[in-house]
Interface confidence: medium
Amino acid sequence: KVFGRCELAAAMKRHGLDNYRGYSLGNWVCAAKFESNFNTQATNRNTDGSTDYGILQINSRWWCNDGRTPGSRNLCNIPCSALLSSDITASVNCAKKIVSDGNGMNAWVAWRNRCKGTDVQAWIRGCRL
């Protein structure tokens, strides 16, 4: 599923991401935009043999199990395919673990490069939340 901007903002808010670990909702919507272009079925392969999955591009080396990433830790204890569902529950729950891990949203390269320090509230402007 490819979410609309405000549709995703509402879904993320419903799942408790607004101000989760101090990150406003705009940060999460911005991250999703630049990680997956709001596409729940996005997959991207990395040079280390891992793959990133879903709307927040969660990595198979650390966070989920795709059955083929050497040394996968599967810290979210889920199959990576669950992160590709049109229901973002699994992605949000795993993202909460990731953002709690110490580096905050710096874990997402796209957030670091494209969202951090910008007017992220623009990503939820005009949305009825």
Epitope: R68, P70, L84
Partner: antibody
Framework: QVQLQESGAEVMKPGASVKISCKAT????????IEWVKQRPGHGLEWIGE????????YYNEKFKGKATFTADTSSNTAYMQLSSLTSEDSAVYYC?????????WGQGTTLTVS | DIELTQSPATLSVTPGDSVSLSCRAS??????LHWYQQKPHESPRLLIK???QSDSGIPSRFSGSGSGTDFTLSINSVETEDFGMYFC?????????FGGGTKLEIK
């Protein structure tokens, strides 16, 4: 137990297309990538590409882009590979395998003859 | 693409001999190297995964070693059922690639 059952041998004319199937049983089909591998005598094994049935995500070896197309039907736990514009170079045994990094589970192979 | 070169192309041995098959990668692939055996008209069968991990049901005479670019499959005291083709495969990067194979034949 995990099994991958491929469709039977095919004899096709040059220029035609063929669709090979791979039915998976014994595991959660949507969770694992399905890989496709080509084997020609004297040419060893070649990785064609892969599909993740749960999402339809596909990746192709550059060499096979435009030649192979992968699809999957999650209702029947079956992956498909269509090969188009067939030539004698496409005559080979085609295998599906479950993409575990290493390929522990293989189909029995589908022999394609283009003549 | 990562190229895998297997040597020798053919190995003629007598049952009871011990042999080593080589697989060399064109760049480092860490330990992401797997070995398969294939008999005529059969699908490949996984022998060793991630350089040295023996798969379940594989006889203990098969072992693997190496890292980086140089890998070895060893068969301690070859049995008649071991004859066939042996392929290595890397899963370090895409596209996945296979070696050209080593044919193990009876002398």
């Amino acid at each position: 137990q995990v099994q991958l059952q491929e469709s039977g041998a095919e004899v096709m004319k040059p220029g035609a297309s063929v669709k090979i199937s791979c039915k998976a049983t014994g595991y959660t089909f949507t969770t694992y990538w399905i890989e496709w591998v080509k084997q020609r005598p004297g040419h060893g094994l070649e990785w064609i590409g892969e599909i993740l049935p749960g999402s339809g995500s596909t990746y192709y070896n550059e060499k096979f882009k435009g030649k192979a197309t992968f699809t999957a039907d999650t209702s029947s736990n079956t992956a498909y590979m269509q090969l188009s514009s067939l030539t004698s170079e496409d005559s080979a045994v085609y295998y599906c395998a479950r993409g575990d990094g290493n390929y522990y589970y293989w189909g029995q192979g589908t022999t394609l003859t283009v003549s | 693409d990562i190229e895998l070169t297997q040597s020798p192309a053919t190995l003629s041995v007598t049952p009871g001999d011990s042999v080593s098959l080589s697989c060399r990668a064109s760049q480092s692939i860490s330990n992401n190297l797997h070995w398969y055996q294939q008999k005529p008209h059969e699908s490949p069968r996984l022998l060793i995964k991630y350089t040295s991990q023996s798969d379940s049901g594989i006889p203990s005479r098969f072992s693997g070693s190496g890292s980086g670019t140089d890998f070895t499959l060893s068969i301690n005291s070859v049995e008649t059922e071991d004859f066939g083709m042996y392929f290595c495969q890397q899963s370090n990067s895409w596209p996945r690639t296979f070696g050209g194979g080593t044919k193990l034949e009876i002398k």
